[in-house]
């Protein structure tokens, strides 16, 4: 019962986490204009992985997609890649874990296979969560570096007469969503791995021993004492570990929008 609960909870937590990773990846507010200690502008800038937006005090919001691929910073490309890998691994992990759930019966699938799949999905969730956390952290580090660089030369101009205020960017909501989502996916993955251990108890396998009694002969083949309720072979509860996590390469494309809100 506890194993089923752990597996189910791990699945739900991972599902929420992956939904969060997808949301964070699609969000426009990865970096937002720093308003602290800044002249009050009637324009608010914010940027995502796929487009940058400007919200005017008039209420109009203009978003422009990054239509170039080669012109983008390598770090941004790396963050995109990490987030997409995280989503892909998480999606595959979710698919695998659905079939691995103890509460779902699919044909005559053995518990050993379910244990395998639970472990596989758990590992996938852990890697997915780590990818998201890494992606968000790389972006956050990039922001911190740029923030202090722009602070160092915040006011530039001609002889100090005409001032140009540089726009500084700080952490956007997407970063916090990404960190939390990555953490949840990671926790879900760990829970799946723990559930897998519960699904696969250590078995004491004895070699079949023949006892020859006078008058009649009986062969005893005992199974694992935890798994079987009596003598004889109990293959239904046998656990076999063979797999590692397998990944597939997927490309996720996001449409660029140019909209006014």
């Amino acid at each position: 019962m506890a194993v089923t609960a752990c597996q189910g909870l791990g699945f739900v937590v991972s599902l929420i986490g992956i939904a969060g990773i997808i949301a964070a990846t699609c969000m426009d507010q990865w970096s937002t204009q720093d308003l602290y200690n800044n002249p009050v502008t009637a324009v608010f800038n914010y940027q995502g992985l796929w487009r940058s937006c400007v919200r005017e005090s008039s209420g109009f919001t203009e978003c422009r997609g990054y239509f170039t691929l080669l012109g983008l910073p390598a770090m941004l490309q790396a963050v995109r890649a990490l987030m997409i890998v995280g989503i892909v691994l998480g999606a595959i992990g979710l698919l695998v874990s659905i079939f691995a759930l103890k509460c779902i019966r699919i044909g005559s699938m053995e518990d050993s296979a379910k244990a395998n799949m639970t472990l596989t999905s758990g590992i996938m969730f852990i890697v997915s969560g780590l990818c998201a956390i890494a992606g968000v952290s790389v972006f956050a580090n990039m922001l911190v570096t740029n923030f202090w660089m722009s602070t160092a030369n915040m006011y530039t101009g001609m002889g100090g007469m005409v001032q140009t205020v540089q726009t500084r960017y700080t952490f956007g909501a997407a970063l916090f969503v990404g960190w939390v989502a990555g953490g949840l996916t990671l926790i879900g993955g760990v829970m799946m791995c723990i559930a897998c251990r519960g699904l696969a108890p250590e078995e004491t396998n004895y070699k079949a021993v023949s006892y020859h009694a006078s008058g009649h002969s009986v062969a005893y083949k005992p199974g694992g004492f935890k798994a079987s309720t009596g003598f004889g072979s109990n293959t239904k509860n046998k656990k076999i570990y063979d797999g590692g996590a397998r990944t597939e390469d997927e490309v996720q494309s996001y449409p660029s929008k140019h909209d006014y809100v």
């Epitope: 502008t41 009637a42 324009v43 940027q47 400007v54 005017e56 008039s58 109009f60 203009e62 005409v162």
Partner: antibody, heavy 118, light 113 residues
Framework: EVQLQQSGPELVKPGASVRMSCKAS????????VHWVKQKPGQGLEWIGY????????KYNERFKGKATLTSDKSSNSAYMELSSLTSEDSAVYYC???????????WGAGTTVTVSS | DIVMTQSPSSLTVTTGEKVTMSCKSS????????????LTWYQQKPGQSPKLLFF???TRQSGVPDRFTGSGSGTYFTLTISSVQAEDLAVYYC?????????FGTGTKLEIK
């Protein structure tokens, strides 16, 4: 046709208050911010502030804080400006205008003339 | 507050002539987020309300004749009328739309000979 219809001229005594209206028509009132601008006779334009009819969020020019109060009423598609403790310095034409792209003002009312005189 | 300086304060021209007026801001009105200049030009004819000519420094408002051109970036902007018509008699104002409070220039009065 998009229009902003402003209330008629006001003749008020010093120290009194005045409330003028700006009725919008021809567009969705809550989708656009309404700005108020002051123009003294023969002089330039001065921005007073704006109100967002959607959420009643407002922003004021520091010079007009305590002097002007901006409100709006979604049901009547109208924006209002109340000027308090009037002095001769407040004698001017007050325009309401609709905010557009680039924070520009694309539609203007005909203006409300306020004359402060004893 | 951002100071908007317009020059000349007034100019008298004959119809068909080309006219250029300038507007200088005390700080850059260029927004790095979209590379747009938050400067607006208005025309106010005698006894009328102001009329929007250009927003984002150079984007012409619909209905504005193409003899009017807005240009410039950062802190220096110009409004050009390629061939002045009698109906262009007005005061032209530039406005900072980037920083609060929004500020207007003192205006350039265009008079026809």
């Amino acid at each position: 046709e998009v229009q902003l219809q402003q209330s008629g001229p006001e003749l008020v005594k010093p120290g009194a208050s005045v409330r003028m209206s700006c009725k919008a028509s021809g567009y969705t009132f809550t989708s656009y911010v309404v700005h108020w601008v002051k123009q003294k006779p023969g002089q330039g334009l001065e921005w007073i502030g704006y109100i967002n009819p959607y959420n009643a969020d407002s922003k004021y020019n520091e010079r007009f804080k305590g002097k002007a109060t901006l409100t709006s009423d979604k049901s009547s598609n109208s924006a209002y400006m109340e000027l308090s403790s009037l002095t001769s310095e407040d004698s001017a034409v007050y325009y309401c205008s609709r905010s557009y792209y680039g924070n520009s003002f694309d539609v203007w009312g005909a203006g409300t003339t306020v004359t402060v005189s004893s | 507050d951002i100071v908007m300086t317009q020059s000349p304060s007034s100019l008298t021209v004959t119809t068909g002539e080309k006219v250029t007026m300038s507007c200088k801001s005390s700080q850059s009105l260029l927004n790095s987020g979209n590379q747009k200049n938050y400067l607006t030009w208005y025309q106010q004819k005698p006894g009328q309300s102001p009329k929007l000519l250009f927003f984002w420094a150079s984007t012409r408002q619909s209905g504005v004749p193409d003899r009017f051109t807005g240009s410039g970036s950062g802190t220096y902007f110009t409004l050009t009328i390629s061939s002045v018509q009698a109906e262009d008699l007005a005061v032209y104002y530039c406005q900072n739309d980037y920083y609060f409070p929004f500020t207007f220039g003192t205006g350039t009065k265009l008079e026809i000979k």
